[in-house]
């Protein structure tokens, strides 16, 4: 099949990291510096990404593959291949468009980038606050306050083990 | 948005010479191939070259007698036509690309076109 395919497409011929050139009888020319071709047969080369300004280049391009970008410190990627570089903020604040801003009490953000999201309301779940939330941290939930009334445990006791052998009485 | 402008046409004799220049505006030309394309009247748009990276690719009939080159200060690039002949009347478009050569490529951005015109 291979040899057919090249019979029928001499560009088929031509690997990675070059063009099939159609001016210059189907010859497999190089790509040129800062572009490249990441599979046989094609009949141009792709141009290399160039990782400007708050991009900084985190894999050089080849002549068969493209360079990848990430971003300078203080920012970090957005979108498919760090297509975008957003200002980081704290923790305990998000991006806005006026810039960083605190989050607002009973919200939180524990990451450097990101919104700020409620805290998890507790009671929700039947349960007590064990420990209050912070603009950099959720609230931490504990036992139930039923749980937690005078004599009661909230370990519960292992069941006692049952012999071999013995079914329940 | 990119804007395209190019300029230097006119009318020139047989044999005459004439450079003709594409500048960018709103965008570099930083990190596209620049090309150039031809349409005679009445006649398919023709691929003249294309220019990326000190490495500049031509279409098969010009034979020596184009060059492209870029001014990176400026932001413009030239093609510059010799010996010209009355076939090589036409509009000249300069295209920008993220594919080197473009001979065979849609460019995603295209001048208005400057015309040529040889004849004595």
């Known amino acids: 099949f291979e040899r057919t395919r090249s019979l029928q497409d001499p560009c088929s011929n031509c690997p990675a990291g070059t063009f099939c050139d159609n001016n210059r009888n189907q010859i497999c020319s190089p790509c040129p510096p800062n572009s490249f071709s990441s599979a046989g047969g094609q009949r141009t080369c792709d141009i290399c990404r160039q990782c400007k300004g708050v991009f900084r280049t985190r894999k050089e391009c080849s002549s068969t593959s493209n360079a990848e970008c990430d971003c300078t410190p203080g920012f970090h990627c957005l979108g498919a291949g760090c297509s975008m570089c957003e200002q980081d903020c704290k923790q305990g604040q998000e991006l806005t468009k006026k810039g960083c801003k605190d989050c607002c009490f009973g919200t939180f953000n524990d990451q450097k980038r990101g919104i700020c999201r409620p805290w998890t309301n507790c009671s929700l779940d039947g349960k007590s606050v064990l420990v209050n939330g912070t603009k950099e941290r959720d609230v931490v939930c504990g036992p139930s306050p039923a749980d937690l009334s005078p004599g009661a445990s909230s370990v519960t006791p292992p069941a006692p083990a049952r012999e071999p052998g013995h079914s329940p009485q | 948005e990119v804007q395209l402008v190019e300029s230097g046409g006119g009318l020139v004799q047989p044999g005459g010479s004439l450079r003709l220049s594409c500048a960018a505006s709103g965008r570099t030309f930083d990190n596209y191939a620049v090309g150039w394309f031809r349409q005679a009247p009445g006649k398919e748009r023709e691929y003249v070259g294309t220019?990326?990276?000190?490495?500049?690719h031509y279409g098969d009939f010009e034979k020596g007698r184009f060059t492209i080159s870029r001014d990176n200060a400026k932001n413009t690039v030239y093609l510059q036509m010799n010996n010209l002949r009355p076939e090589d009347t036409a509009v000249y478009y300069c295209?920008?690309?993220?594919?080197?050569?473009?001979?065979?490529?849609?460019?995603?951005?295209q001048g208005q076109g400057t015309q040529v015109t040889v004849s004595s």
């Open positions: 295209a920008i690309s993220l594919k080197y050569p473009m001979a065979t490529v849609t460019p995603d951005y």
């Open positions: 220019y990326w990276s000190g490495y500049a």
